[in-house]
């Protein structure tokens, strides 16, 4: 699987999961997130080889066709695959509230 | 929606579907398909700018953090959101056989 | 029941030749796209050479002008040439049968050694 589990341990040119730190303040200029101050949100990237962990028929048949056509455009894009959520603390005035947000997490990637 | 109703009838640079004529015999060297000789496969290809399209919470704040730091490497990329089957006909000697082979055409595209 | 057999691998020094093969078993061999994987420790199984089921056939950048990947249907049987190895073509060589109706297989592999 082209997991977090693989994918950080691995030099992996090919579509894997990459480590990215996300500062709320910094990075996105959110000032109303009180905790965490940032999150591994991570990402997807590297190309996607014929039969790489393909997601669809379709993403399989663009596989074969770009590693038999390699002048092509078309190819499979390394994306999410399995999410996780993420848990913040903010404030409606002094009032604290806690939220889950679906989704905010990479755990693996997959070619689509 | 980023579909072929729309993207085929638009010069659009940023992620849309993308017509596809994929020549069975030609273009995968598959000779055992008999109908049809090809198909509109499509493709998704295109930037993904901020909130467009975004497939989940993870890929809205990444596409913020693309938008914030230009520099990163790290952003949503353009792939198949609703596709579609397509139906075959091959022989198993002079038998004929008729499959429907599930998604296959892609109808829309989405950032992930 | 399906059966892929990779031989043919084993150690061989650098400059030197091995001739790889896959033979299928309980499936229609004409209608696969066949391949060669290969998987380095560590590694994720990479594309080595692939031959279509009408006899396409496309390289790794790395193996281009060294291997010659073959089919032969009268045998259900896929060949793997490989001239003037080198040191990082040793991994486990994984031979591979696609068709989009069905699923896809793979052999158990055959581990190829390059050293002096």
């Known amino acids: 699987a082209l997991d977090t589990n693989y994918c950080f341990r691995n030099l992996e040119e090919n579509c894997c999961v990459r480590p990215l730190y996300i500062d709320f303040r910094q990075d996105l200029g959110w000032k109303w997130v009180h905790e965490p101050k940032g999150y591994y949100a991570n990402f997807c990237s590297g190309p996607c080889p014929y039969l790489r962990s393909a997601d669809t028929t379709h993403s399989t048949v663009l596989g074969l066709y770009n590693t038999l056509n390699p002048e092509a455009s078309a190819s499979p894009c390394c994306v999410p695959q399995d999410l996780e959520p993420l848990t913040i603390l903010y404030y409606v005035g002094r009032t604290p509230k806690v939220e889950q947000l679906s989704n905010m997490v990479v755990k693996s990637c997959k070619c689509s | 929606a980023l579909d072929t109703n729309y993207c085929f009838r638009n010069l659009e640079e940023n992620c849309c579907v993308r017509p596809l004529y994929i020549d069975f015999r030609q273009d995968l060297g598959w000779k055992w398909v008999h109908e049809p000789k090809g198909y509109y496969a499509n493709f998704c290809s295109g930037p993904c700018p901020y909130l467009r399209s975004a497939d989940t919470t993870h890929s809205t704040v990444l596409g913020l953090y693309n938008t914030l730091n230009p520099e990163a490497s790290a952003s949503p990329c353009c792939v198949p959101q609703d596709l579609e089957p397509l139906t075959i006909l091959y022989y198993v000697g002079r038998t004929p056989k008729v499959e429907q082979l599930s998604n296959m055409v892609v109808k829309s595209c989405k950032c992930s | 029941q399906v059966q892929l057999v990779e031989s043919g691998g084993g150690l061989v020094q650098p400059g030197g030749s091995l001739r790889l093969s896959c033979a299928a078993s309980?499936?229609?061999?004409?209608?696969?796209?066949m391949g060669w994987f290969r998987q380095a420790p560590g590694k994720q199984r990479e594309l080595v050479a692939i031959?279509?089921?009408?006899?396409?056939?496309n390289y790794a950048d790395s193996v281009k002008g060294r291997f010659t990947i073959s089919r032969e249907t009268a045998k259900s049987t896929m060949y793997l040439q490989m001239n003037s190895l080198k040191s990082e073509d040793t991994g486990v060589y994984y031979c591979n049968a696609h068709w989009i109706v069905t699923t896809d297989y793979w052999g158990q592999g055959t581990q190829v050694t390059v050293a002096s």
């Open positions: 031959v279509t089921s009408g006899g396409r056939t």
């Open positions: 309980g499936i229609s061999f004409s209608y696969y796209d």
